[in-house]
């Protein structure tokens, strides 16, 4: 296989919709940003499809993606972050479509890890935490984070939580007692960057205590 | 048509500061990239410094680094180039550019002069 379709080929994929997005990382894996683009419509024939961008890097005009299954990958220290680079599906040497995009409004932060949650008898309340690799970068330091939670039996029933530190308090009285509750979070740029929420990091499961008859107080576990 | 119009050159001695403006009437200003060139007499153009539509990504070149700090006030459709350490080798034309596309800057302005006696 050469990459380069036929003519037959290149008539076919003109007819075809090769929508696509993307999301960017930044400081992903120590200096290095990466940049992940996926078609819309997942029955698109990849076959002799490539992706590249152009313009708004550092020492070179243009880079191709890594096909990696479904998607598009690059990872480099190239990316200038500043203006717009041009992100074309290409089949052969002709581009199929293209658009026009700025790196630092598509970001996709790095999802929240350690959450736990930690059940304080004497304040009757129960603290979350959790934390994020976005603390230690250069670029994208600030976020809103979204905590949800559930009691496990209520299969969509998630209160959600928009927080900008990583420590949430719940007051115990807000819970139901003797139930087991499911939590996550996930986070989104805030100031500076614009973006997409992170994947959700795992779920932490915590049960809330029996309610003390004598005193309408929830039993510690 | 964008308008972006400079301001604050002048006379200055070596070792001194002066800080550019560079006001802009683009209705997207707050999205666009923007940046600073010189251009001295007989010379070609040279990049000095660019900056992000919301100014947490900047990049200087090699010859002004350290001495020059370009920021930006999108409420004021604005953005500066501070100048400290001037040395009589950055008399030049000043000129600021908006929008940067795929590597083509698609707005300029006319420009103000600097110079730095000795």
């Known amino acids: 296989e050469s990459g380069y379709a036929q003519n037959g080929d290149l008539e076919d994929a003109e007819l075809d919709d090769y929508s696509f997005s993307c999301y960017s990382q930044l400081e992903v894996n120590g200096s290095q940003h990466s940049l992940t683009c996926a078609f819309e419509d997942p029955d698109v024939n990849i076959t002799n499809l490539e992706f590249e961008i152009c313009g708004a890097l550092v020492e070179v005009k243009c880079l191709n993606f890594r096909k990696l299954q479904e998607i598009y990958f690059i990872e480099t220290k190239k990316f200038l972050l500043i203006g717009k680079s041009n992100i074309c599906v290409k089949v052969g040497e002709k581009s199929l479509t293209c658009k026009k995009i700025d790196l630092t409004t598509i970001v996709k932060p790095e999802a929240p890890f350690d959450l736990s949650v930690v059940y304080r008898e004497g304040a009757n309340d129960f603290v979350v935490t959790f934390n994020t690799s976005h603390l230690q970068k250069k670029y994208v330091k600030v976020l809103m984070h979204d905590v949800a939670y559930r009691q496990e039996k209520d299969e969509n029933k998630w209160t959600h939580v928009n927080l900008s530190s990583t420590k949430l308090t719940l007051l115990q009285r807000k819970l139901q007692p003797a139930a087991m509750y499911e939590i996550k979070v996930r986070s989104i740029p805030d100031h500076y960057f614009k973006g997409f929420w992170s994947e959700w990091s795992p779920s932490y499961y915590f049960r809330t205590p029996e309610i003390n008859n004598s005193s309408g107080e929830m039993d510690p576990i | 048509e964008v308008q972006l119009v400079e301001s604050g050159g002048g006379l200055v001695q070596a070792g001194g500061s002066l800080r550019l403006s560079c006001e802009s009437s683009?209705?997207?200003?707050?999205?666009?990239?923007m940046g600073w060139f010189r251009q001295a007499a007989g010379k070609e153009r040279e990049f000095l410094a660019a900056?992000?539509?919301?100014?947490?990504?900047?990049h200087y070149g090699d010859s002004v680094k350290g001495r020059f700090t370009i920021s930006r006030d999108n409420a004021k459709n604005t953005v500066y180039l501070q100048m400290d350490s001037l040395k009589p080798e950055d008399t030049a034309v000043y000129y600021c550019?908006?929008?940067?596309?795929?590597?083509?800057?698609?707005?300029w302005g006319q420009g103000t002069q600097v110079t730095v006696s000795s």
């Open positions: 900056i992000n539509w919301s100014g947490a990504v900047t």
């Open positions: 683009a209705r997207t200003f707050s999205d666009d990239a």
């Open positions: 550019a908006e929008d940067y596309d795929t590597d083509v800057w698609q707005h």
